[in-house]
Interface confidence: medium
């Protein structure tokens, strides 16, 4: 079989948007199955026709309604003949059009009067492509070959830049890049103090507008009264916009404020935010926990816990915890130093512990008291164990 591409030179140049019909002539075969191939891949679309000129002569058409750059490439046709694939001479399809931008000027944010660069690149075909720069509605500088870099010594206000690419087919305009002026950031807001303990506090905040320059760090300033002596100043890299304050004094009133900085400098401080650290949990366990059996149940007694440090604050109530080996367990809160225990099984051993609480939490547990199921009613059961 003889194959040839008809009606086209080895190189075919077409303007973008124009139609193209590639013709492939096959002679010496009665029913050729003509396939079109572009850059090594079979063209699987339906834009193909086959015309029988005679029994042994066929013409295949590949019809493209409106060529675009992606249609450019190397085309050939092929047929199977006796198990072998015959291929035609290729045709190189070049699609010409107005320049196509591969690099366009990007939006920038720069400090006032700081130098910066903008880039623009466009390609054909046809080549050459020249670039003209625009600042707003003013043309700046003569045509330069593509690619082009525009060096700007600085701006004092937000300014628009664009480039224009020219070739023999016409011109194309790039996107408009806005060069913004950088500024100091705005003050942070929504400052919240969370996870308060007696010596630590977590702070979180929302950053204000960054002034079009990346926020680099934030400073958390802590005082014991608004405007008082600085107790602590922590500089944290951001993001995240959080900070853990350590080594604070328990049960103490503090105030904090936050500011953030970019490359140009710091924002104003946000308003003071007051917070108070928690006091200390009780340090002592109730002593001399003992039990008295009565006809109505079991009475538990212990000695009152006296605060060791003013930071513990007022103590009370007491928390009583009991468990039996049948899995029954319970906790009850008691205001005084005496509790009447009900709902337990006298046939099973009982283990009881007690602790004193304050606003922060419960102190250490007392040593456990084991009330044995063998104890006779009315007898006080001393603890079997002294482990805490």
């Amino acid at each position: 079989a003889g194959l040839k591409l008809m009606g086209a030179p080895v190189k075919l140049t077409v303007s973008q948007g124009q139609p193209v019909k590639l013709n492939c002539s096959v002679e010496g075969m009665e029913e050729p199955d003509i396939q079109w191939v572009k850059d090594g891949a079979v063209v699987q679309n339906l834009d193909q026709l086959y015309i029988p000129v005679s029994e042994q002569h066929w013409i295949g058409f590949l019809s493209l309604k409106s060529v675009e750059r992606s249609d450019a490439g190397r085309y050939w046709c092929q047929v199977e003949d006796g198990g072998e694939t015959e291929i035609s001479q290729p045709v190189w399809l070049t699609v010409e059009g107005v320049p196509f931008f591969t690099v366009e000027p990007k939006d920038l944010a720069v400090p006032p009067n700081a130098p910066f660069q903008l880039s623009c690149e466009a390609v054909g075909p046809p080549e050459p492509v020249t670039i003209v720069w625009w600042r707003g509605t003013t043309k700046i500088g003569g045509p330069a070959p593509s690619p082009s870099v525009l060096n700007v010594t600085g701006v004092t206000q937000s300014t628009m830049f664009s480039c224009e690419a020219h070739n023999l087919k016409g011109l194309a305009s790039s996107r408009t890049a806005t060069v913004h002026l950088q500024a100091l950031p705005a003050a942070p807001f929504n400052i919240t103090v969370t996870k308060l303990s007696s010596s630590n506090a977590s702070v979180a905040w929302m950053p204000g507008a960054d002034g079009r320059a990346l926020l680099q760090s934030c400073t958390v300033q802590v005082t014991q009264a608004p405007g008082g002596w600085e107790v602590l100043a922590v500089v944290v890299p951001v993001p995240p916009f959080t900070c853990l304050l350590r080594d604070l004094v328990p049960a103490t009133n503090y105030s904090l404020r936050v500011r953030c900085a970019n490359a140009l400098g710091p924002s104003p401080y946000a308003d003071w935010v007051p917070f108070q650290t928690k006091g200390l949990a009780p340090a002592s366990a109730p002593q001399n926990l003992h039990a008295i059996r009565t006809d109505s149940g079991l009475i538990l007694e212990w000695e009152e816990v006296i605060p060791e440090a003013p930071l513990e604050g007022p103590l009370g109530p007491y928390k009583l915890s009991w468990v039996q080996d049948n899995g029954t367990q319970d906790e009850l809160t008691v205001e005084g130093t005496r509790a009447n225990l009900t709902g337990w099984d006298p046939q099973k051993d009982l283990i009881v512990r007690v602790c004193v609480s304050n606003a922060v939490g419960c102190g250490p547990w007392s040593q456990p008291l084991v009330v044995s199921s063998h104890d006779r009613a009315g007898q006080q059961g001393p603890p079997h164990s002294r482990t805490s």
């Epitope: 199955d33 679309n45 339906l46 193909q48 026709l49 086959y50 015309i51 029988p52 309604k65 409106s66």
Partner: antibody, heavy 125, light 108 residues
Framework: EVQLVQSGADVKKPGASLTISCQAS????????ISWVRQKPGKGLEWMGQ????????MYGPSFQGHVTISADRSTATAYLQWRSLEASDTAMYYC??????????????????WGPGTLVTVSS | SYELTQPPSVSVSPGQTARITCSGD??????AYWYQQKSGQAPVLVIY???KRASGIPERFSGSSSGTMATLTISGAQVEDEADYYC???????????FGGGTKLTVL
Amino acid sequence: EVQLVQSGADVKKPGASLTISCQASGYTFTDYWISWVRQKPGKGLEWMGQINRHASNTMYGPSFQGHVTISADRSTATAYLQWRSLEASDTAMYYCVRSGGATSGGTIPEYYQHWGPGTLVTVSS
Amino acid sequence: SYELTQPPSVSVSPGQTARITCSGDALPKKYAYWYQQKSGQAPVLVIYEDWKRASGIPERFSGSSSGTMATLTISGAQVEDEADYYCYSQERKGNYFVFGGGTKLTVL
């Protein structure tokens, strides 16, 4: 004269299989593609798919891929449309159409100029 | 999947110009074809490759395409032109064909 003769109307129950046919005459079967077009009662035309002139390559519309099979027998110049399991929504008129190719003069392409009379398929329980 | 959009109906008086549009994202790259289907009959090709008139079609039928819109124009519509008209084209990659939803032309 180009003629496309389609098999007669058919009534089937849901889940049944069915093959309808389209026999071509008046031209060389292997010079052209055959397409199938569906038209539901009172509705528009839907392109289902086509088989190339060598009966070696099929293309389907997205809605029909996997639901129907298009085939052809070159020796009898007949194209087929086949269902393995019919559904009530398959009730429609089915046209076979000669597509692609060209007139003997090789100038005016005959795009879908020759249509069969249609086969009415009714799927009802 | 790809769609071609047509108006459901167009009405004109006899002798007036009827325009039926068809829009689809691939129409800048793919040719449009137009079919006429009269009640109870198989469709008939009217226009192929955007603007070319099929054999036996009166000169009052013409086609055009611009951007994503193809248009079938009937200059001086006749009562016998009353029918359903379908546009027809390919999706962008050329892997399958699609018919538009159809436009009912009424010549009052």
